[in-house]
Amino acid sequence: SEVGNSQAVCPGTLNGLSVTGDAENQYQTLYKLYERCEVVMGNLEIVLTGHNADLSFLQWIREVTGYVLVAMNEFSTLPLPNLRVVRGTQVYDGKFAIFVMLNYNTNSSHALRQLRLTQLTEILSGGVYIEKNDKLCHMDTIDWRDIVRDRDAEIVVKDNGRSCPPCHEVCKGRCWGPGSEDCQTLTKTICAPQCNGRCFGRAPNECCHEECAGGCTGPLQTHCFACRHFNDSGACVPLCPQPLIYNKLTFQLEPNPDTKYQYGSVCVRSCPHNFVVDQSSCVRACPSNKMEVEKNGLKMCEPCAGLCPKACEGTGAGSHYQTVDSSNIDSFVNCTKILGNLDFLITGLEGDPWRNISALDPEKLNVFRTVREITGYLNIQSWPKHMHNFSVFSNLETIGGRSLYNRGFSLLIMKNDNVTSLGLRSLREVSAGRVYITENRRLCYLHTVQWAALSRRRADLDIRNNKPRGKCQQEGKVCDPLCSADGCWGPGPAQCLSCRHYSRRGVCVESCSFTQGETREFAEGTECFECHPECERVEGGITCNGSGADTCTRCAHYRDGPHCVERCPEGILGERGPIYKYPDSSRECRPCHENCTRGCTGPLLQDCLGDALPSARRAPTVI
């Protein structure tokens, strides 16, 4: 049978030789998992199954992506007549894609006698371990090297059945059982030396396509028994149609309308409903550095800008904890949003002997550097003596005020004698509630802050008994000259609410590096951004006027259409296959002859690198 397009896929297991329940329970589990299954995504583990188990439901399995483990069973035959490929993406004991052991009962004659894997012709990764199966026959008549792709794979076949019938004479000593229908099909060791994979005959022109796995019926990639990499509508391909293809007119990678996604070893137009798209694959869940988003009705994984959103429960009313303390500080690791409030009380920082809570290590307060939003209030009534600001909250942007402290406060900072500045450099909004900042004897800068700009409604402020404004000015505790009149959270150009001139990554600067400096910049509004790395630095002039590689004054390496590129396209997927270009004398990328398959040094057929396709009498396509 040749590769089909739709197949019943089921999950495998990862239990090893440990199972729960008795043999009957094991059988039911296997039946539920694998009945009508064609592709096992994971491992096929058959362990501790009884002698009367009817395993004929396994007969549809054609492929296992992980390993096959058969151990401590008592049934006589394992019916996997359609199993073609074991991929070995996971292996047992670090090296085995097939692991068969102890399949007999020491107190009875019940035992595994036949492994009828008559179609198994490919193990893509990993070796074979078949040991101590007292009555299992014909394992040493199989040429395992013909099946195993990796020539260094370990093959252990020993201490199995001893008084076994010979192979049928038509099998020439290679068989899975005694019948004429049990012969092993050889698809590798019989091939002509010209074949670099498998073959369907001994002649030099009877090689399978290199994308085939397990053999084939003919030379094309649609003639494969199974695919080495991916099956795209019946053709074996190294990659599924990619999400981006090179557009010859715009000289850019653009969305491919014919994109498909990898689902196991199959290319599919859309992932199953409980999967999401990650780059070009269907996955059960996004990796930890990405988050799930929906775009045009498609669930996709997108890289998080910085940390992925993580919401955590806060402290105070409605929470398990009264204050941040040593018992709960670790629960705030990597949190970007606090659902509720944050309270810092003396019993949290210095410990609470009554509740057997030790003092908090001040270093641990750095966990709050990831917090961008607090939905409730922020209440700081105790702070470590050596910490002179609240810079651990330097990324806090919003205090929601959905729940309020005491008499309606959303931001409360009081009696912190060592604090000299707030350091809340990212705070842009206090959505609701009052601001209460009192009795912080050394605290400066707060008078400069335009609180009204932070509040959605008229700011209700109670700010008193901090260091007097005049005293702060006398001591030079004033905003940096690069700050605007909006004020600042503390000393230096990184603490401004906004900038007088320009800003670079949150720090106020006199000017952007338009025409000098190691790294050149352009401005968007009053924000400085670096030019694209493919722009060449122009001495005494403008290097770029935007962020893209098409906004450079000159290119650092090569130019492909309007875009500066590190190298000219080499095998980038286009609408009609890979695209190759070469750089001309003015470092412009020009198309190779259309018959070049590995790149070129010039526009002519004789300039192709490696083998070219047989010449069609046509001029090169002009791009």
């Epitope: 990862l14 030789l17 440990s18 008795d22 501790l48 401590m72 047992y92 004991d93 670090g94 020491t106």
Partner: nanobody, 114 residues
């Protein structure tokens, strides 16, 4: 993390006895399938004895009737009682556990002199 530590190996006269122990940590010991393998110099590793999670036991042909595998769940320890030892039993003996994945101990040397 699963850890297996073998002990009890040593030098013994032919016909003598040894008892190997394998202290296990990081697994639910009572239901863990476990076993003993051995590897003699220049030879393949071979299965000596195995005990399944439901206490079924298997032995290699060459040790049947001489070796006994057992476990003490209160001590999380697997044992191999080796009697009537022969020079061909000389090998490094390894403990394995097969909970989810296979874990190996570092091995203990048994030398049987004639």
């Amino acid at each position: 993390e699963v850890q297996l530590v073998e002990s009890g190996g040593g030098l013994v006269q032919a016909g003598g006895s040894l008892r190997l122990s394998c202290a296990a940590s990081g697994l639910t010991f009572g239901s863990a399938p476990m076993g003993w393998y051995r590897q003699a110099p220049g030879k393949e590793r071979e299965l000596v004895a195995y005990i399944s999670g439901d206490e079924r036991i298997w032995y290699g042909d060459s040790v049947k009737g001489r070796f006994t595998i057992s476990r003490d769940t209160t001590k999380n320890t697997l044992y191999l009682q080796m009697n009537s030892l022969k020079p061909e039993d000389t090998a490094v003996y390894y403990c394995v556990s097969d909970v989810k994945v296979r874990h190996w101990g570092q091995g203990t040397q048994v030398t049987v002199s004639s």
